[in-house]
Amino acid sequence: PEPPTACREKQYLINSQCCSLCQPGQKLVSDCTEFTETECLPCGESEFLDTWNRETHCHQHKYCDPNLGLRVQQKGTSETDTICTCEEGWHCTSEACESCVLHRSCSPGFGVKQIATGVSDTICEPCPVGFFSNVSSAFEKCHPWTSCETKDLVVQQAGTNKTDVVCGPQDRLRA
């Protein structure tokens, strides 16, 4: 028979032979031959391979470096990498989560639209008319201006996006 030019799924072609790939969690020790099946060995502690493969070395699990604000979200196995996330109050700088930065605070005049998570930063939005924020915060939303009317008071000083309205008593001298 003619030597194969293509192999089945989970096989690879070497020396005109179709060899079985190693399953996830195992590395290649020896290619198959005319006389032998592919030889694979399990990855060691703190190593992984996440695909059917012919790698001769397993990959090292990612290290969640506390000095970079990282902690383990999910421990790696022989088939999966460790997943890192950031300590409370911090978030990842990239999808790979290789380092963390402090959550951004929303300045006065801006409120929190979406609170930060371990993987995403705070999203701020400008306080619209009728709302204000007078603090720099990573949690506070824009607050509505006080309704003077409901307190039987009148607006003495108009609100801004950074300040609440100031209410005062009604003018009793009116006819």
């Epitope: 028979p1 020396n15 005109s16 032979q17 079985s20 020790v29 020896s30 290619d31 031959t33 005319e34 006389f35 032998t36 099946e37 030889e39 001769t56």
Partner: antibody, heavy 115, light 112 residues
């Protein structure tokens, strides 16, 4: 081209050890196991075992496990088979062989065990 | 260990005629991966072995097409369609499905 060249004939006394070498050339040494087979005079063939030069991993015929040692020196692309506590029944031609993209045999090393 | 039994022990043949050697194993040589690791090789007088066939029926490069292998499970055959003078020697079957690898006792092919 692929070649396996073995060391010369040996004459040993019972109880002694012998170390046979097999120098490989013409291919990447660490890419293929080296296996050892012996053929006693007028007898059949016996598989002794094999070694993976990449990591030194071995597999053996249980019959030889306690007496045979397989090693490699990757710096000189050479495999070794040492057989200890020799007996007269160990008199044989010892072959190294490599397979994968063809099968290649050394020329054989005659080991004679005689008092 | 898997016992490999060859027959006949000796096979006198006429040049140009066919020859057939049988090899039986004491257990199935079908590997869990679907391959059957049964092989044939030739040893001419005073020479190292030379492999002819691997995995039942695959000829090694450079092996003449007058050599063919067949069989499955425990029963295997090597055929030489037209024997030539250079085919004289001992033919062995071997299996590498099970450890330890084992060999048949050999069949001596000689010219009548």
């Amino acid at each position: 081209q692929v070649q396996l060249v073995q060391s010369g004939a040996e004459v040993k006394k019972p109880g002694a050890s012998v170390k046979v070498s097999c120098k490989a050339s013409g291919y990447t040494f660490i890419s293929y196991y080296i296996y050892w087979v012996r053929q006693a005079p007028g007898q059949g063939l016996e598989w002794i075992g094999g070694i993976n030069p990449r990591n030194g991993g071995t597999n053996f015929n249980e019959k030889f496990k306690s007496r045979a040692t397989l090693t490699v020196d990757t710096s000189i692309s050479t495999a070794y088979m040492e057989l200890s506590r020799l007996r007269s029944e160990d008199t044989a031609v010892y072959y190294c062989t490599r397979h994968g993209n063809g099968v290649y045999w050394g020329q054989g090393t005659t080991v004679t065990v005689s008092s | 260990d898997v016992v490999m039994t060859q027959s006949p022990l000796s096979l006198p043949v006429t040049l140009g005629q066919p020859a057939s050697i049988s090899c039986r194993s004491s257990q199935s040589l079908l590997h869990s991966n679907g391959n059957t690791y049964l092989h044939w090789f030739q040893q001419r007088p005073g020479q190292s072995p030379r492999h002819l066939i691997y995995q039942v029926s695959n000829r090694f490069s450079g092996v003449p097409d007058r050599f063919s292998g067949s069989g499955s499970g425990t029963d295997f055959t090597l055929k030489i369609s037209r024997v030539e003078a250079e085919d004289v020697g001992v033919y062995y079957c071997s299996q590498t499905t099970h450890v330890p690898w084992t060999f048949g006792g050999g069949t001596k092919v000689e010219i009548k």
